[in-house]
Amino acid sequence: WELTILHTNDVHSRLEQTSEDSSKCVNASRCMGGVARLFTKVQQIRRAEPNVLLLDAGDQYQGTIWFTVYKGAEVAHFMNALRYDAMALGNHEFDNGVEGLIEPLLKEAKFPILSANIKAKGPLASQISGLYLPYKVLPVGDEVVGIVGYTSKETPFLSNPGTNLVFEDEITALQPEVDKLKTLNVNKIIALGHSGFEMDKLIAQKVRGVDVVVGGHSNTFLYTGNPPSKEVPAGKYPFIVTSDDGRKVPVVQAYAFGKYLGYLKIEFDERGNVISSHGNPILLNSSIPEDPSIKADINKWRIKLDNYSTQELGKTIVYLDGSSQSCRFRECNMGNLICDAMINNNLRHTDEMFWNHVSMCILNGGGIRSPIDERNNGTITWENLAAVLPFGGTFDLVQLKGSTLKKAFEHSVHRYGQSTGEFLQVGGIHVVYDLSRKPGDRVVKLDVLCTKCRVPSYDPLKMDEVYKVILPNFLANGGDGFQMIKDELLRHDSGDQDINVVSTYISKMKVIYPAVEGRIK
């Protein structure tokens, strides 16, 4: 019996087609992805093949103005329109709190939403009961397939799930649910979830009875043969893991941002064992037409977004200096504003010993593309912020050793004076440079704000200590020459859309007046 698994993950609000780098579509003839194009390909496959499941491995939420405005209603609407069969909860599904998950998505989705390792307690338990499930048995033709969900247990540090959801260890939580499926005579089981490729492989290895793992969170691109675009494969598709009980378990992921549709064909024997698995992600490029009906619906929903862009988010009573003359040479108040917003967006009081789990922010000055003039009645709009942060990036959470941070700050000024983008703006950091010294030895003082303290204060950076830092995904990926971050980071979790982080902060503060205050000397 043959099953076709179509899968997406980490779509992050890319409902419309995007450029090849998943930013805003500029030249339509070269654009990719989007739900209208995805629908065309899915329908093509559904028409051609008998047993097809369309699955999503989480993080539909967060990433563009679509999520900012529609807050998840767009996810439910268009996933329903595409007729998804199941979805696993990702960490970003909790970005607007549990209510922001329940109302727009859990109550509106026609498909089951899954996670076996999230347990509700207290008053939330009855409120959320039945709205998400540990597993679901799906009929496919004359057979049944069990889908069991999982979500990153780091979610409390990455999003806002509140205090009434417990995120258990994935493997510990999955095993009894898979065992239950086996007792229900379900012998074909897919683990669908959002914990990253390393955990996906562990699940394949450790959870007895799981036949296939469909993952997300790490934006992993797997491919067999010559890859069709710029993404470099982390391994073959599917990635085969030998389980502890000797089975070959295919593990898949489909990069991110709706650029690819994962396509996996699995052949099962009559006892539900995987006989063979093959496939590849399908690049959703312009050779695949956008479905006119879904496209028309997208255009209808778009109208509200255009109106939102020009509405006032808040006010500034000072000039927000985002000029390259400032931000690539010295501390600039736009950099301070953005870093303050980045830290504010990551306030998570999950431990009494820590005032917060992260206190530091770094931001390449070259990523700040425009100032905002306060003389327009102080008004700040989404449109204004889109000029400051036009690249559609995210502000991510990484873990780095102090020694890596020291290298990053040396790189920040290694060719100071040439108006290059690598000059770092900061938050929760005091750095002193001596530019008379030779490149690679210019950082003379580097103090960082403590986290394990009740009164935050600055202490000297310790080379061997591991620190959490918020930074743009561009830097996490080694952009602007920050190869040391990419090579040496110990953990990387993708965060919220850059403009959304700053706009939320401005809306919260109502009136802002960021200063240049001696963070960089």
Epitope: F39, R83, K110, P139, V140, D142, E143
Partner: antibody, heavy 121, light 107 residues
Framework: QVQLVESGGGVVQPGRSLRLSCAAS????????MHWVRQAPGKGLEWVAV????????YYPDSVKGRFTISRDNSKNTLYLQMNSLRAEDTAVYYC??????????????WGQGTMVTVSS | DIQMTQSPSSLSASVGDRVTITCRAS??????LAWYQQKPEKAPKSLIY???SLQSGVPSRFSGSGSGTDFTLTISSLQPEDFATYYC?????????FGGGTKVEIK
């Protein structure tokens, strides 16, 4: 082979009740949504009810809502339509039809031969 | 509710003719449209689903097209056994609704 056979039709007085059955064979009945569709003499097709594969949801058009109830017994591979408060306009051939395997609306790939229901005093 | 309007309600054609029947939805239904054939005193038979997919066993002279609100069923070369009534049906949302039917008669 895949087959649907309806039974239970007949002549009934207005206001009375009737229960139709549909016996399924040749496929995994419990995996499919099942529908009733009717056709009044000389008229077109009208959808009457659906029950999802796991009985989790049932849907009806306004014309029969509150009067008709669809149910199924997966252990017996049988679909039912309980029709109460019957009216003259319910006179039709009632077909049972197989839908899809999910919770989304679907088309009908397999149809029964139909059973005639006549509501008349 | 979504209204389905079929046209024409009847047509006369000869064997070998190309026949086109149209179906219009009162609102967008994407490609969630099916076509059925019904002969007198018989149950309907599924021809096409998802607007353009041929049900297995249906001759390739039948084809469907369209998306959104406007759909077409085409019989490329009418055969004697094709004289029947044809219905479209939307399955975008409940309640499921049918077109009024198109009767294809012998000229």
């Amino acid at each position: 082979q895949v087959q649907l056979v309806e039974s239970g039709g007949g002549v009934v007085q207005p206001g009375r009740s009737l229960r139709l059955s549909c016996a399924a064979s040749g496929f995994t009945f419990s995996n499919y949504g099942m529908h009733w569709v009717r056709q009044a003499p000389g008229k077109g097709l009208e959808w009457v009810a659906v029950i999802l594969y796991d009985s989790s949801n049932k849907y009806y058009p306004d014309s029969v809502k509150g009067r008709f109830t669809i149910s199924r017994d997966n252990s017996k591979n049988t679909l039912y339509l309980q029709m109460n408060s019957l009216r003259a306009e319910d006179t039709a051939v009632y077909y049972c039809a197989r839908g899809g395997s999910s919770w989304y609306p679907d088309s009908f790939d397999i149809w029964g031969q139909g059973t005639m229901v006549t509501v008349s005093s | 509710d979504i209204q389905m309007t079929q046209s024409p309600s009847s047509l006369s054609a000869s064997v070998g003719d190309r026949v086109t029947i149209t179906c219009r939805a009162s609102q967008g239904i994407s490609s969630w449209l099916a076509w059925y054939q019904q002969k007198p005193e018989k149950a309907p038979k599924s021809l096409i689903y998802a607007a353009s997919s041929l049900q297995s066993g249906v001759p390739s002279r039948f084809s469907g097209s369209g998306s959104g609100t406007d759909f077409t069923l085409t019989i490329s070369s009418l055969q004697p056994e094709d004289f029947a009534t044809y219905y479209c049906q939307q399955y975008n949302s409940y309640p499921l609704t049918f077109g009024g039917g198109t009767k294809v008669e012998i000229k």
